[in-house]
């Protein structure tokens, strides 16, 4: 079957069946704003959701990909890297019927999609177009190519404290 691999580099194909270990991000900025306890002493800022030692923020406002990236950076976070099945299911459970920018961009010179931590995305991005170099999730079960200049919602993520 097709499963996520364990090397934190997005999606891959393996020959044997298996389960997937929990994989966490490596950056650890401190949350800002009002802190609320979430689980076993870990905390996320107000309006952020806790999952597997990470905090996630889903915007209701919309902006371009660059503005979204900067918004997340300003909150001590990054656009979400959706590289485990656990994280994918969690995000499908909490995203409204809207499109959300994530941290996945097309590198035209390489002709490949990469997460913003530079790891390779080995899945398939739908709706590809020569002018669509950013990606969204939500609304559908797929990773959809999108214009980086169109305004969509965003998902930010960072380590829980």
């Amino acid at each position: 079957p097709q499963i996520f691999n364990k090397s934190n580099d997005g999606f891959t194909t393996t020959r044997s069946y298996g389960t997937v270990s929990q994989i966490f991000g490596s950056s650890s900025p401190s949350p800002n704003g009002f802190i609320t306890t979430r689980s076993y002493g870990t905390v996320c800022p107000k309006d952020w959701e806790f999952y597997q030692a990470r905090c996630f923020f889903l915007s209701t406002s919309e902006s371009s990909w660059n503005e979204s990236r900067d918004f997340c950076k300003g909150k001590g976070s990054t656009l979400a890297i959706v590289n485990t099945p656990e994280k994918l299911k969690f995000l499908q459970d909490i995203t409204d019927a809207e499109k959300y920018f994530i941290g996945l961009i097309y590198h035209r010179e390489e002709k490949r999609w990469r997460w913003i931590n530079n790891s390779v995305f080995n899945g398939n991005v739908t709706n590809q177009n020569q002018n669509f170099n950013c990606a969204t999730i939500g609304l559908t079960k797929t990773f959809d190519a999108a214009s980086c200049d169109i305004s969509y919602r965003r998902i930010c993520e960072k380590n829980a404290k």
């Epitope: 097709q2 997937v20 099945p85 459970d93 019927a97 899945g123 079960k141 797929t142």
Partner: antibody, heavy 116, light 113 residues
Framework: QVQLQQSGAELVRPGTSVKISCKAS????????LGWVKQRPGHGLEWIGD????????YYNENFKGRATLTADKSSTTAYMQVSSLTSEDSAVYFC?????????WGQGTLVTVSA | DIVMTQSPSSLALSVGQKVTMSCKSS????????????LAWYHQKPGQSPKLLMY???TRESGVPDRFIGSGSGTDFTLTISSVQAEDLADYFC?????????FGGGTKLEIK
């Protein structure tokens, strides 16, 4: 911890309607899809629909469209399902469950009996 | 609608034995974009609500013992219990979460000898 507490059993007449509640606690109610599932002995489990409380967006199984109505009250973190024009086929246990497509947390179920 | 078919409808085993149950879907549950199979497994103990065991065919829900193993792809899926325990007495349901309406199999009743 995540909890979904459903309202008690209902005995209702054919042709009438019933409204079941599901009180959520232990998580951000507005930010998670909440589904409803019907279980009849010998008929297995049947997905009715789901709601995103933050926006009120809903999806329905065509089999229940027009008869089932899903709503959510953000202030009380309670979701509701109303089913109208009840028949004996609607006698079942109804569950609320958190999630968009697969469900990790379930209410304890509400038994609805439709009888004259 | 996608039809889910489970087999066998019931089985009885002794504690420690290996259990295998099947679930077949009327169309592929494989998502080409994210490379996951949208198939979940639940068990439901007598008088209780269903409990999620597995999603994406092979990803164990948090807290589920590792004796539960999900496998398969496309239309054919299997839930294996490597060494059945007395507390595993339950009805087991598969569910496709690929497209609406999400549909469930008829269930496999596991009895302990």
């Amino acid at each position: 911890q995540v909890q979904l507490q459903q309202s008690g059993a209902e005995l209702v007449r054919p042709g009438t309607s019933v409204k079941i509640s599901c009180k959520a606690s232990g998580y951000g109610f507005n930010n998670y899809w909440l589904g409803w599932v019907k279980q009849r002995p010998g008929h297995g489990l049947e997905w009715i629909g789901d709601i995103y409380p933050g926006s009120g967006n809903t999806y329905y199984n065509e089999n229940f469209k027009g008869r089932a109505t899903l709503t959510a009250d953000k202030s009380s973190t309670t979701a509701y399902m109303q089913v109208s024009s009840l028949t004996s086929e609607d006698s079942a246990v109804y569950f609320c469950a958190r999630g968009k497509e697969s469900f990790a947390y379930w209410g304890q179920g509400t038994l609805v009996t439709v009888s004259a | 609608d996608i039809v889910m078919t489970q087999s066998p409808s019931s089985l009885a085993l002794s504690v420690g034995q290996k259990v295998t149950m099947s679930c077949k879907s009327s169309q592929s549950l494989f998502n080409f974009s994210n490379r996951n199979n949208y198939l979940a497994w639940y068990h439901q103990k007598p008088g209780q609500s269903p409990k999620l065991l597995m999603y994406f065919a092979s990803t164990r829900e948090s807290g589920v013992p590792d004796r539960f193993i999900g496998s398969g792809s496309g239309t054919d899926f299997t839930l294996t219990i490597s060494s059945v325990q007395a507390e595993d007495l339950a009805d087991y349901f598969c569910q496709q979460h690929f497209t609406t309406p999400y549909t469930f199999g008829g269930g496999t009743k596991l009895e302990i000898k």
